[in-house]
């Protein structure tokens, strides 16, 4: 969906629900910028490619980010 000039943030709602890292296809962290003054986290799920906005302040999401970064550091040489 193309964004209008005034709407640059992506997330309309944000989820506090825990996400199973195994169900994740991709996790995008979009830093705050001149276009959107807040960090946005978008999870792409393996199921039907659903994209879900996550709450960066949620404990469950912070734990998910830790788990994902741990997994990445294991994989990197």
């Amino acid at each position: 969906v193309p964004l209008s000039r005034t709407v640059r943030c992506t997330c309309i709602s944000i989820s506090n629900q825990p996400v199973n890292p195994r169900s994740l296809e991709k996790l995008e962290i979009i830093p705050a910028s001149q276009f959107c003054p807040r960090v946005e986290i978008i999870a792409t799920m393996k199921k039907k490619g659903e994209k879900r906005c996550l709450n960066p302040e949620s404990k469950a999401i912070k734990n998910l980010l830790k788990a994902v970064s741990k997994e990445r550091s294991k994989r990197s040489p």
Epitope: V1, S4, V7, C11, I12, S13, N16, K48, G49
Partner: antibody, heavy 124, light 109 residues
Framework: QVQLVESGGGVVQPGRSLRLSCAAS????????MHWVRQAPGKGLEWVAV????????SYADSVKGRFTISRDNSKNTLYLQMNSLRAEDTAVYYC?????????????????WGQGTTVTVSS | EIVLTQSPGTLSLSPGERATLSCRAS???????LAWYQQKPGQAPRLLIY???SRATGIPDRFSGSGSGTDFTLTISRLEPEDFAVYYC??????????FGPGTKVDIK
Amino acid sequence: QVQLVESGGGVVQPGRSLRLSCAASGFTFSTHGMHWVRQAPGKGLEWVAVIGFGGLIKSYADSVKGRFTISRDNSKNTLYLQMNSLRAEDTAVYYCAREGDGSSLYFYYGMDVWGQGTTVTVSS
Amino acid sequence: EIVLTQSPGTLSLSPGERATLSCRASQSVSSSYLAWYQQKPGQAPRLLIYGASSRATGIPDRFSGSGSGTDFTLTISRLEPEDFAVYYCQQYGSSPIFTFGPGTKVDIK
């Protein structure tokens, strides 16, 4: 339980203003986008406006642009619709509705919770 | 602006029968952006389907959604007495803008 309760409807003359409120309870209001949707007597649903969870995203139907303003107060768990320059064609039941959990400009989870509506009648 | 057309306008069926409701868009719509709602007289709408085919929480599995591009379908496999209502499809587009179809009324034959 999860609930949305609209208030502020009534009979108003053309050209006048009215402010609708929607009180939310039973969920974390501050993480959900919110909508106003209306339904004229005997007609279908018409989307009016949306506001993102933090108020940064706002959008309006062409039919109300420049006349209606959507806003929210997350500290009061309340959504508002300020309606100015009202016309006879604005007569309808106005519903507030919650945007689904985690909706973004890339994936839409639908309006998953609705209030029972408040009636606005614009008549001289 | 994308326009949604629903057909038929009214569907007269008996309990136990299968209902097939159509929603056609004037331009291609991503299935990620299509939802279906049910509305009974004097009540608020209820979300049935999002993402064209995912059932909302608490929706019975007799309701299913399908389709892509410009043609989408809501199927009720076996009509129960409580399913007689008006059904709306809805599309989410740029800006963001949310558009409803005109509705299909499912009534008792």
